[in-house]
């Protein structure tokens, strides 16, 4: 085991080993955001699919209420892209007056909240000025890093404005996490 | 084994551990495209480098025809990056007699090919306007996510503009995959 | 193991099987950059923080001098995000007398020191024209892919203008590996 | 195999115009840049521009900004060049080119001749 | 707009002969050069993409290098039938534009 020849000679505790088939693992999709109240001050969560089409929870991973639920310790690689769409900012009426205008914005973030703690946690944020010459424009956002986490943490994803995420694809907007 | 005491004195079954070497796994990298015949109604795929540089297909991930084959079911991360780059779109030509041009685009979809369905699969799409002002511009598309795949899936990378796809270095445009 | 049944009477040497707890990883995240002597033709390296809030090194994963050693041979996923930010590049004076400016641009580049070979090589790049409108612009560029590293090799993450990283946030701007 | 074929030579009158035609054939036309570029008599090449067969948008150098228009047919896989006020320093060979990708030029049509004389 | 300037206009060599061919961008151009043969009476034919990759079906004696603004065509063993004129030729930015060509001739 790791790596040695199996001695019965001397009885040993090895580190936890374990089949990788049997680790928490979601994958989340998107689906059409209904109007709902959000937190003052902070970003809206979207809500997700968790079992239709592409998308999945496995392994104790849980998805409830715009939350993915962490069944374990340990470092999982989280992951979120959300593709955004809209009309021309405002930003390109060309330098009105010769004064530029503040450029509009897209973020998203990926939050942690441990509820033994009293603030989210931001893990990552994806922040881009929108500032196109277009009639309408779209591009997505990609985030992906990881983190060690704590059984009973829970993962959302905040966009800066739920009005403008794309929908339609399930291959477009999505989020997913794995313990490694 | 999965982090109990050895004990001979009782038999079990545990689920199947592998060693993380054994894993198929592949980075490919971009080559120039030559003009050739696509599918009609479907972005065209990109073949890739699989041997030469940062490239490998390891443990029976192997790449055949701008496929990469899936040698065994499981969960598996998937990603790829291309670098566009093109001249000033029509995009840019300002509101030409106060009517906003459709803005011209560039996307990323990696898609599955399962025989035994009629139909491929777009797992991940990247898609952006592109309504750029200065006279060349270039930027990329990054995609990652985690999928249930099957022994004989096949996966591809197809994009909207093939001749607009960054060929000239290896760290620009490529594409892998990991069982987990 | 690997999915046998338990079988004394006949030994056995197993692929290395290890606990995943035990393998080398990091998750680095932005600090202010201060003015340092950079190699010349080569874009400016980041340094990172490597134990505080998000940040950490594990499993003899070390980080020092700008570089994250490479502890084992294996297999790895490499990532990072840099979130830049500037004023408006001078291509957005929409094209003067006619003649399109060339874009600015921003380039992040993740690349392998291998004490043995003279050249660095680039493992990732990420780069994308810059050519806004609006009077202030941010945008970040993410990356990540798998890689066969060796023992002692050494990663960095190399920008090609450290005033424009945006290091006010630790989810913006960071930099990970870890085995797979 | 990839094939680019060019209507026939023409002799044309300064101040004509003149319409060259591209077949393509052995790949899919929409999905990459057409290109033209000509050569006078003992001299180097010139880029005079491309199409996106695609979504018809064109690029043409400066120099024939106003005097040239690229189209293309995609239901026939047929570009066209149609270059007008003629002048006597447009004889030239005319060639059509794809390119794998839009900066390059892997397959050349066979040349048209264009003279222009009075 | 970029201009390419070549070196030597002409030259003269014989079967087995190292030929080597400079090509010099006016300003950077990365890495998009690409080089081309061409003959009397012919269409020109593309050997080498991105400075240094060899076209599929080009022989491999037949090799660039260079970056920036400073490219190399070296054809390492001249054979009969590479007598011809080359031209370099930049795909950073519109208006692609073309060395003057160098003719390679038989001494």
């Known amino acids: 085991l790791k790596g040695q020849e199996f001695a019965p000679s001397h009885q040993q505790v090895y580190a936890p080993l374990r089949a990788d088939g049997d680790k928490p693992r979601a994958h989340l999709t998107v689906v059409r955001q209904t109007p709902t109240q959000h937190f003052k001050n902070q970003f809206p969560a979207l809500h997700w699919e968790h079992e239709l089409g592409l998308a999945f929870t496995k392994n104790r991973m849980n998805y409830t209420n715009k939350f993915l639920l962490i069944p374990e310790s340990g470092d999982y690689f989280i992951y979120s892209q959300v593709t955004f769409r809209g009309m021309t900012s405002e930003c390109s009426e060309i330098r009105q007056a010769g004064r530029p205008n503040k450029p509009d914005s897209i973020t998203v973030v990926i939050t942690k909240v441990t509820d033994s703690y009293p603030e989210p946690t931001q893990l990552l944020m994806g922040t881009k000025s929108v500032c196109e010459v277009g009639s309408n424009w779209f591009q997505p956002i990609y985030l992906g890093a990881m983190f060690s986490l704590q059984e009973g943490d829970k993962l959302m994803v905040n966009v800066s404005d739920i009005s403008l995420v794309d929908y339609t694809k399930e291959d477009k907007t999505f989020f997913g996490a794995f313990l490694l | 084994l999965k982090g109990q005491e050895f004990a001979p004195s009782h038999q079990q079954v545990y689920a199947p551990l592998r060693a993380d070497g054994d894993k198929p796994r592949a980075h490919l990298t971009v080559v120039r495209q030559t003009p050739t015949q696509h599918f009609k109604n479907q972005f065209p795929a990109l073949h890739w480098e699989h041997e030469l540089g940062l490239a490998f297909t390891k443990n029976r991930m192997n790449y055949t025809n701008k496929f990469l084959l899936i040698p065994e079911s499981g969960d598996y991360f998937i990603y790829s990056q291309v670098t566009f780059r093109g001249m000033t779109s029509e995009c840019s030509e300002i509101r030409q007699a106060g009517r906003p041009n459709k803005p011209d685009s560039i996307t990323v979809v990696i898609t599955k090919v399962t025989d035994s369905y009629p139909e491929p699969t777009q797992l991940l799409m990247g898609t952006k306007s592109v309504c750029e002002v200065g006279s060349n511009w270039f930027q990329p598309i990054y995609l990652g996510a985690m999928f249930s795949l099957q022994e004989g899936d096949k996966l591809m990378v197809n994009v909207s503009d093939i001749s607009l796809v960054d060929y000239t270095k290896e760290d620009k445009t490529f594409f892998g995959a990991f069982l987990l | 193991l690997k999915g046998q049944e338990f079988a004394p009477s006949h030994q056995q040497v197993y692929a290395p099987l290890r606990a995943d707890g035990d393998k080398p990883r990091a998750h680095l995240t932005v600090v202010r950059q201060t003015p340092t002597q950079h190699f010349k033709n080569q874009f400016p390296a980041l340094h990172w923080e490597h134990e505080l809030g998000l940040a950490f090194t594990k499993n003899r994963m070390n980080y020092t001098n700008k570089f994250l050693l490479i502890p084992e041979s294996g297999d790895y996923f490499i990532y990072s995000q840099v979130t830049f930010r500037g004023m408006t590049s001078e291509c957005s004076e929409i094209r003067q007398a006619g003649r399109p400016n060339k874009p600015d641009s921003i380039t992040v580049v993740i690349t392998k020191v291998t004490d043995s070979y003279p050249e660095p090589t680039q493992l990732l790049m990420g780069t994308k024209s810059v050519c806004e409108v609006g009077s202030n612009w941010f945008q970040p560029i993410y990356l990540g892919a798998m890689f066969s590293l060796q023992e002692g090799d050494k990663l960095m993450v190399n920008v090609s203008d450290i005033s424009l990283v945006d290091y006010t946030k630790e989810d913006k701007t960071f930099f990970g590996a870890f085995l797979l | 195999q990839v094939q680019l074929v060019q209507s026939g030579a023409e002799v044309k009158r300064p101040g004509a115009s003149v319409k060259v035609s591209c077949k393509a054939s052995?790949?899919?036309?929409?999905?990459?840049?057409l290109h033209w570029v000509r050569q006078a008599p003992g001299q180097g090449l010139e880029w005079m521009g491309w199409i996106n067969p695609k979504s018809g948008g064109t690029n043409y150098a400066q120099k024939f900004q106003d005097r040239v228009t690229m189209t293309g047919d995609t239901s026939i896989s047929t570009a066209y060049m149609e270059l007008s006020r003629l002048r006597s320093d447009d004889t030239a060979v005319y060639y059509c080119?794809?390119?794998?990708?839009?900066?390059?030029?892997?397959?050349w049509g066979q040349g048209t001749m264009v003279t222009v004389s009075s | 707009d970029i201009q390419m300037t070549q070196s030597p206009s002409s030259l003269s060599a014989s079967v087995g002969d190292r030929v080597t061919i400079t090509c010099r961008a006016s300003q950077s151009i990365q890495s998009y050069l690409n080089w081309y043969q061409q003959k009397p009476g012919k269409a020109p034919k593309f050997l080498i993409y991105g400075a240094s990759s060899l076209q599929s079906g080009v022989p491999s004696r037949f090799s660039g290098s260079g970056s920036g603004t400073d490219f190399t065509l070296t054809i390492s063993s001249l054979q009969p039938e590479d007598f011809a004129t080359y031209y370099c030729q930049q795909g950073y930015s519109t208006p692609f534009t073309f060395g003057p060509g160098t003719k390679v001739e038989i001494k």
């Open positions: 052995g790949y899919t036309f929409t999905a990459y840049y």
């Open positions: 080119a794809v390119g794998g990708s839009y900066d390059a030029f892997d397959i």
